[in-house]
């Protein structure tokens, strides 16, 4: 009696399972009573990532550099190519197909994490007590100056902005 | 695929201009689009990019007098206080780090 | 912001020669360097991307080199047509997040 199911890695075609194509292969022929599952490697710039019965393998992605996009990780008959952006750009999703440019965190946020290929800066308000002046896709937000560890005493307070100002001590005649 | 400039013309210092380059065959919100500029019988000068999300980056000498915006189809450049300096041909160019794809550009004149 | 320094501003020579010109940024750029061939009243043509990499439709005569600080843009077996102005332009990313795009002063080349 002809099978309805199949083993893993094998299909039914012609009330008779057959053998998948491995990886990085692409099927030619159904087997038979006679003759077992022809398959044929992947060409150049082509793979297959799992056990399947194509009859096409697929392209290899292309990390178009005119949208700032670079191999990371170069194709193989079993895997796709990885694509990156170039630094200062990130990828817009997961798929990574096209990049943007690298925010920075403005006057009174710092860096939280800085951005990478795949992810943009995350800026973080500075809380009190910290300050960033300046727009940066690095700096962190920096602490208020300690005037007292410096003799002195606070003559303008600090801001999310500004650093406090310290000035002397008033002494008593 | 293609880029055009226009809204160049002979100006008097001072007055502000927008030039706008209109492009076709693909689209602005997957590619970054530069200006750049060229001085008559002087060198490229890069004057700032805009991104797919409209962010825009600048040429430290260019912040504060030149503004790069975009719609669907079209990225303007916006200048103010133009000087006879600014006299050259301004080029709209397609690319993130390189440009592959350039309009044949638009001369502005300053001169009083 | 990173300066490009090209060399020599012009060079002279004859038809299916080799012309070599040089290209120094003033910090390590990597590999992010174009190379541009502009004629008379034309926008500049993008034939070179990332140092080495040609350009779609450019001829294998143009050969371009280099890493760091020091590239090279090689012109072999020299035609008529390839007279014109070279530009070497670099992008670089700062790791104080700034941005810098930058053009050679350009290179005149002569074909006898």
């Known amino acids: 009696e002809p099978p309805t199911a199949c083993r893993e890695k094998q299909y039914l075609i012609n009330s008779q399972c057959c053998s998948l194509c491995q990886p990085g292969q692409k099927l030619v022929s159904d087997c038979t009573e006679f003759t077992e599952t022809e398959c044929l490697p992947c060409g150049e710039s082509e793979f297959l990532d799992t056990w399947n019965r194509e009859t096409h393998c697929h392209q290899h992605k292309y990390c178009d550099p005119n949208l700032g996009l670079r191999v990371q990780q170069k194709g193989t008959s079993e895997t796709d190519t990885i694509c990156t952006c170039e630094e200062g750009w990130h990828c817009t999703s997961e798929a990574c197909e096209s990049c943007v440019l690298h925010r920075s965190c403005s006057p009174g946020f710092g860096v939280k994490q800085i951005a990478t290929g795949v992810s943009d800066t995350i800026c973080e308000p500075c809380p009190v007590g910290f300050f960033s002046n300046v727009s940066s896709a690095f700096e962190k937000c920096h602490p208020w100056t300690s005037c007292e560890t410096k003799d002195l005493v606070v003559q303008q307070a600090g801001t999310n902005k500004t650093d406090v100002v310290c000035g002397p001590q008033d002494r008593l005649r | 695929q293609s880029v055009e400039e226009s809204g160049g013309r002979l100006v008097t210092p001072g007055t502000p201009l927008t030039l706008t380059c209109t492009v076709s065959g693909f689209s602005l919100s997957t590619y970054a689009m530069s200006w750049v500029r060229q001085a008559p019988g002087k060198g490229l000068e890069w004057i700032g990019i805009?991104?797919?999300?409209?962010f825009t980056v600048y040429a430290n000498w260019a912040k504060g007098r030149f503004t790069i915006s975009k719609t669907s189809t079209t990225v303007d450049l916006k200048m103010t206080s133009l000087t006879a300096s600014d006299t050259a041909t301004y080029f709209c160019a397609r690319g993130a780090t390189f440009f592959g794809l350039w309009g044949p550009g638009t001369l502005v004149t300053v001169s009083s | 912001d990173v300066v490009m320094t090209q060399t020599p501003a012009s060079v002279s020579a004859a038809v299916g020669g080799t012309v070599t010109i040089k290209c120094q940024a003033s910090q390590s750029i990597s590999g992010v360097l174009a190379w541009y061939q502009q004629k008379p009243g034309q926008p500049p043509k993008l034939l070179i991307y990332r140092a080495a990499d040609l350009a779609s439709g450019v001829p294998s005569r143009f050969k371009g080199s280099g890493s760091g600080t020091e590239f090279t843009l090689t012109i072999n077996d020299l035609e008529c047509d390839d007279a014109a102005t070279y530009y070497c332009q670099s992008y670089y990313y700062s790791n104080s997040g700034s941005y810098s795009y930058a053009f050679g002063g350009g290179t005149e080349v002569v074909v006898k």
């Open positions: 805009i991104d797919g999300s409209s």
